[in-house]
Each structure stands twice: as C-alpha cells, then as structure tokens.
C-alpha cells in the first residue's frame, strides 16, 4: 500500500501476492469527511491500473474484481473526481503476481583443492517474479549438519565455507537445496557424495621442462601437485597448432618424459590432475608453459640452382641460388651456408661460408669441369650437401622442351606448358622451370625463381613472386645426366596496354634509309609482356593516314631501319608498343628529312 494515505484506503483480497491466473478484489474507500465538499453523493471514485482507468463508482467506496494480471508488479491507484476540480489521488496498492518455485534441479557440489571449501550449484527453474530465498543444507556423518541461506534474487550458487578432509574419504555427505517464496516452497532431490567425489584438485603449478644434454630426445616435464593426486593428463602442442597431443599418466609424482617433440619448436604444455581413477573430476588445466625445444642438426638437402654467364673468351660467371630449408628440415636457426666449388680434374677446391644470403656469385675459368656443393649449418651441425655439376644447361638442342607456352591462370599465377624434347623423352630425369622479371638490360641482380618438375609432367603452375602487369622471362630446362636443353618464353599473369610508347632518341641517315633508335619503355609502364613495336610516319603537313612498320619485340633490340622515306620530304615519326591487351599511347614525335638524292 502507498504509505500514509490520508484520504482513504485501498484494500486487496485475498492477498497482495497472488499466483499467476488468480482473481483479486480491490476496494477503494474514502475516510470520513474526505469526499467532495457539500456534494458527498457526487463523489466519483475512479480506479486506475497504472495510468489506465478500469472502473469508477459514485459514492464512498468502490469494489472491483480484477483478473488476467501479468507476472510482476501491477500498481492500482484510486482517485476522487469532484465537479470543477482535478482528480486527486486517494490511495494505491501494488499486486505482486508470481509462481511458486520449481524444484531445483541438478544440484552438484565441489571442493576446489584439498584445502578449499564446499560449494554447490543448481538450476533454479523458471523465474518466480517474486523474492525467493534458497537454503542449502549439508548433512554428514555423526549427525553433523551445516546450513547456508542465499539472499540473492537469482541464487544458484552457495559456498558453505567448510572444508572436507581426507581422513575418511569414503564417508557420505548429503546436500539438499530448498527454495521458498510467498507462494510456496520446493526442495531438490538430495545429492549424496564422498570426499573423493567432490574434491576437484587445484591445477598443477610450477611447471618446468628440462632437456638433458640439450637434446630434444631427452626431455622431462616437471610440475607440482596437491598431495593426494593419483592421475595426471598432459597436453602439448606446437604454439602455431590448434591440435593437442594428449598423454594420461598414473602416479607420475610430478614428472614425465616426452619422447616425440620436434626440435627447435616452441611448444605449449598444460597439465591437469585427478585424485581417483573413476571418482571425482579433473582439475582445471594448469597455466601454460611455453618452451622452445633445442636444435638438432638439419635434415634434408638444399634445393640448389645456378646460372652461367659468359664474360670473355676465358672466364665465366657462375651465380648459385638455393632455397631455405623448411622449418622442419632446418631444425634450428641456420647460421650460415657452406659453398664448396671444386674443379673435378685438378682437385682444386674453394670453400666459403655465406651468411644472410641464399645466393653466391663467382667467376671461374671457362675450361675444366666444375662442381659445387652447398649445405646449411645450424648450431648442431650441417645438412647433407647438395652437389651439382656445372654444365651448359642449354647445350643439348635435342633435349630442348618443345612448344613452350605461358598463360595467365587467375590472379598472379602463370601456367607453363611444354612438350617433351624430340630426343628420347624417357631420357629426361627432371624438368626445371625458371622465371625472373624481364629487365631489358639483362640485369643479373634480378631475383631468380625456379621449381622442379617430375619427368612425366608437361606443365607447371608458377605463383611464387609473380606480380600483375610484369613480364617474366620463363625457361624450361630438361635435364638428363650431365646434359641439358632449354627453351624460353615470355609470360605474364595479367596485362593491359602499355602506359606509354617508346621514346625516339635518335634518327640517323644511312645510304638512303634511316635508322631509328629508341629508349625502352620503363618496366613499370610496360604493363605486361610487349609483343610488338610500331613505328608510324607521315608527311609533316599531310592529313593522310600515317604509314606504319610493325617490329616483333626482342629484349635487346632498340633500333630499326626504314627505307621507304622520300628524300627532301619532312616526316613526323613516332612509336607505340603493344601487349596482348592493346596498344600504348604515342611516344614522342620526331621530325626528319632525308637528304639523299631522289630516284
């Protein structure tokens, strides 16, 4: 009821707390001399449900039967309306609609750790919409009982604050929870358990790992546990993996040897504990220990490739390239690569350690038979050396793969296809597909990429270090013993018309014809592989269509003769470049007048 109603009363029957679906009677009555002055018969009492008028009556009291109230609290306010004045509040009352508590379900109790306290949880069931008090009762041997009450509205957890001890681990304890509100009460089914059933050990702590003689094969995990722990389970995984390896151990006494760890790998380790083979529950997982296993000497062999370049009649440049070992092969931090160059007949050998690079260039005589061996070293040792005899990779014409093609295959991929060489195809031991960005100057500093393909393959998809709108020089080598044949092609993964045309830098006259020289289009403006250049010319002040000459693109070419110009006529000349996607805009225009005699 609203406190201190001076003008009247509102009463609720049978109660101001009702079960959902019940009916209530609400009475509003005026106190003596609290009606309308002079016009007591004109008293108009109005009953509001919150702000909605639900009933009215002339006189000193009003009765109303109300049904269908929703769960929760509904406020009823009674007002008096007199002629020529505002309604005034007389009194009000709240009605609380709820339900009796349902039977609490799934009562379960645990004690966290041997020194912890017993705490229980349960499911309350549906909301009562009323203040509901929960009482938890625990009875044990020798008629011992403990009781705890919960004042929280949504109570589904209580801690007794008592500690069960392992003196009599088989003694039975029984817990029960009772819910009470204004509409009724209900108790859970009893839950009976022993010390071993409910004690959940604390997670193991102080986890450490030791590698004897810095070897991954002699690894022991150590930890600390509560005194009564019988079982442990260990889980571990490489830090970059989502899958755990699991191991169950009994009576481990805080140590376990791990035999299957990979070298030079960061692992995450966690441990959980349990007091009894089939009773009780596992502890939470311990905090993670992260540790890196020691290095082991590398396994596997480096993938090595090379390139030869003629310098002069007596010398050649050899550039060696190799790929990093995979993490699982390197088994540690690669400190250096050891390159040994040997002349096979004379036995001269030169060894060099390379750090920070995966390539090496040297100059050797063109005479003699040369071989190289390359290995990778970490703190524990070296990989087996990869040995290669240096040969002229393209010398055997009959071993050259045929009909090499390069086609764009989706974003930043090029599909290279070929036909086996004319010479007995079964002689091919492997194909090597090599690619690098095409630079007109033939720059040897441009990174080299390669992949190896089995002898029965006639295609390879290249995707490593492939950029859109860049032209690649692609070579396919067929290797057989110490012979090799090769074929090359230009290819790109994506192309469009070049952004600019070649810049004509000179026009010179030679015996009645002219020689046009130009600068190459910058690589970043070529927008793919160039197929042709076009040279256009027309008489200076003529409106006629220009004549043109189309020249197939060759990397090293940057001049071309034209012999169809008339003497003593001034011509305007310009150039364009074409990819498979189209023609560039004009390069610069140059004027030229041939001085030679007329025919």
């Amino acid at each position: 009821k609203i406190d201190a109603c001076k003008r009247g009363d509102v009463t609720v029957k049978p109660s101001h707390v009702i079960l959902l679906g019940s009916t209530v009677n609400i009475t509003c009555s005026l106190k003596p001399r609290q009606g309308c002055f002079h016009y007591s018969r004109r008293n108009k009492l109005i009953l509001y449900k919150f702000d909605r008028r639900i009933n009215f009556h002339h006189g000193h009291s009003l009765n109303s039967q109300v049904t269908g109230l929703p769960l929760g609290t509904t406020l009823f306010v009674c007002k008096l309306a007199c002629i020529n004045s505002d309604e005034i509040q007389i009194c009000g009352a709240e009605i609380f609609v709820g339900v009796a508590p349902e039977q609490p379900q799934n009562l379960s109790c645990i004690q966290k750790g041997e020194q912890g306290t017993v705490a229980c949880t349960w499911e309350r069931g549906r909301d009562t919409h009323l203040y509901t008090e929960y009482t938890l009762q625990l009875s044990g041997p020798k008629n011992l009982t403990w009781q705890k009450q919960c004042k929280d509205i949504y109570c589904d957890y209580l801690d007794f604050g008592i500690n069960l001890t392992p003196e009599s681990p088989e003694s039975n304890f029984t817990a029960k929870v009772t819910a009470v509100n204004s509409l009724g009460s209900s108790s859970s089914l009893p839950s009976t358990f022993t010390f071993l059933d409910i004690v959940r050990p604390l997670p193991p702590w102080d986890i450490r790992i030791k590698f004897q003689k810095a070897s991954v094969s002699r690894c022991t995990l150590y930890w600390r546990d509560e005194g009564l722990v019988l079982l442990n389970r260990l889980r571990y995984r490489p830090s970059n993996s989502r899958l755990w390896n699991m191991v169950n151990v009994t009576k481990a006494k805080g140590r376990h040897d791990l035999l299957d760890l990979k070298p030079f790998t960061e692992y995450e380790f966690q441990i959980s504990s349990k007091l009894h083979l089939y009773k009780g529950s596992w502890s939470d997982w311990s905090e993670s220990l992260r540790a890196q296993t020691p290095e082991e000497e590398p396994t596997g062999m480096l993938d090595v490739w090379y390139m030869k370049r003629h310098i002069d009649y007596s010398r050649q440049q050899i550039s060696l390239f190799w790929k990093n070992l995979s993490v699982s092969e390197a088994r540690g931090k690669i400190l250096h690569y050891q390159v040994t160059l040997q002349e096979l007949t004379g036995g001269k050998a030169m060894t060099q350690n390379i750090t920070g690079h995966t390539s090496w260039t040297t100059v050797i005589p063109r005479t003699g038979n040369w071989a190289v061996a390359v290995s990778a070293a970490n703190s524990k040792g070296s990989s087996l050396p990869t040995r290669i005899n240096i040969m002229n990779l393209c010398e055997a014409g009959l071993l050259a793969p045929r009909q090499v093609s390069a086609n764009s295959e989706g974003m930043d991929n090029i599909l290279v296809t070929w036909q086996p060489p004319r010479k007995d195809p079964s002689a091919v031991q492997e194909y090597v597909v090599e690619w690098r960005e095409l630079h007109p100057g033939g720059d040897t500093q441009v990174p080299l990429n390669w992949l190896r393909s089995r002898p029965y393959n006639v295609s390879a998809l290249i995707s490593e270090n492939i950029k859109s709108y860049i032209c690649y020089e692609i070579r396919v080598y067929a290797l057989s013993g110490d012979q090799g044949g090769c074929s090359s092609i230009l290819g790109n993964s994506k192309h469009k018309a070049p952004l600019s045309g070649p810049h004509i830098n000179a026009i010179t006259e030679e015996k009645g014809s002219i020689l046009i020289s130009w600068n190459s289009i910058p690589v970043q403006e070529q927008m793919g592989c160039l197929l042709h250049y076009r040279i256009y010319w027309k008489e200076r002040d003529s409106n006629s269509q220009p004549q043109l000459c189309e020249i197939p693109y060759r990397v090293s070419q940057n001049s071309h003769p034209i012999n169809s110009l008339q003497p003593r006529v001034t011509y305007v000349l310009w150039m364009t470049a074409l990819t498979a996607a189209g023609e560039s805009s004009h390069g610069n225009e140059r004027e030229f007048c041939l001085q030679g005699k007329a025919n």
């Epitope: 406190d3 101001h16 707390v17 929760g72 609290t73 406020l75 709240e94 609380f96 909301d127 919409h129 009323l130 203040y131 004042k151 929280d152 509205i153 949504y154 204004s182």
Partner: nanobody
Framework: QVQLQESGGGLVQPGGSLRLSCIAS????????MDWYRQAPGNQREWVAS???????YYDDSAKGRFTISRDNAKMTVYLQMNSLKPEDTAVYYC?????????WGQGTQVTVSS
C-alpha cells in the same frame, strides 16, 4: 537490505528541466518495478511514474507528456527527466521499490519551481 538514494533536485524556473536519479543497492532491483512519488507541502505522497523491469513506463496524468522515466539495470539506477516544469510540480520527489515484503523508499530530493 535495499537502500535508495535520490539526487538531481534543485531550484528551476518555470518551463525549465531537471533530471532526477535514484541509485539502488542490493540485488532485488532487477525483478521489481521502480516508482517515483512526490509530496508537496501539506499534501500526501502521490504517485508520479513507474517503470517495469523490462522498461515499460507508466505515468500519472499530471506527468504525461512532460516527464520521462527510464532505468539502467546494469547501474541499478532509475531516472526521471522532467521538462516544462510548473510551479505546481514543486515537491519532494521520492523513489520507491515495491516488494511483496514491503516498500523501500529513498530519502527524497527537493524540487522547487519558481521564478
């Protein structure tokens, strides 16, 4: 035990605005209505507005269109935004939590509307 503390009252000119707050302690806040009442000098306490736990608001005719009640269950706070205030709104404003075990009232905050 539930305790309620109102704030935000003060002196304001006719037509002005005030925002009252009422902060509750105790866990029962989330299942009960929250109400605002007021008591002018010499009068009895009158209901002004209520809000249900799910946020449905109700107003007395004297507050409709001018006052807005709201609640923040996470902060256990109920608000009354009062606009277009009139001299007859002068009163002590109380917040209340009605429960089946009894009503909990705050101490009240004075609102004076005067030029």
């Amino acid at each position: 035990q539930v305790q309620l503390q109102e704030s935000g009252g003060g002196l304001v000119q006719p037509g002005g605005s005030l925002r009252l707050s009422c902060i509750a302690s105790g866990s029962i806040f989330s299942i009960y209505n929250m109400d605002w009442y007021r008591q002018a000098p010499g009068n009895q306490r009158e209901w002004v507005a209520s809000i249900t736990p799910s946020g449905d608001p109700y107003y007395d005719d004297s507050a409709k269109g001018r006052f807005t009640i709201s609640r923040d269950n996470a902060k256990m706070t109920v608000y009354l935004q009062m606009n277009s205030l009139k001299p007859e709104d002068t009163a002590v404003y109380y917040c209340k939590v009605p429960t089946e075990k009894g009503n909990y009232w705050g101490q009240g905050t004075q609102v004076t509307v005067s030029s």
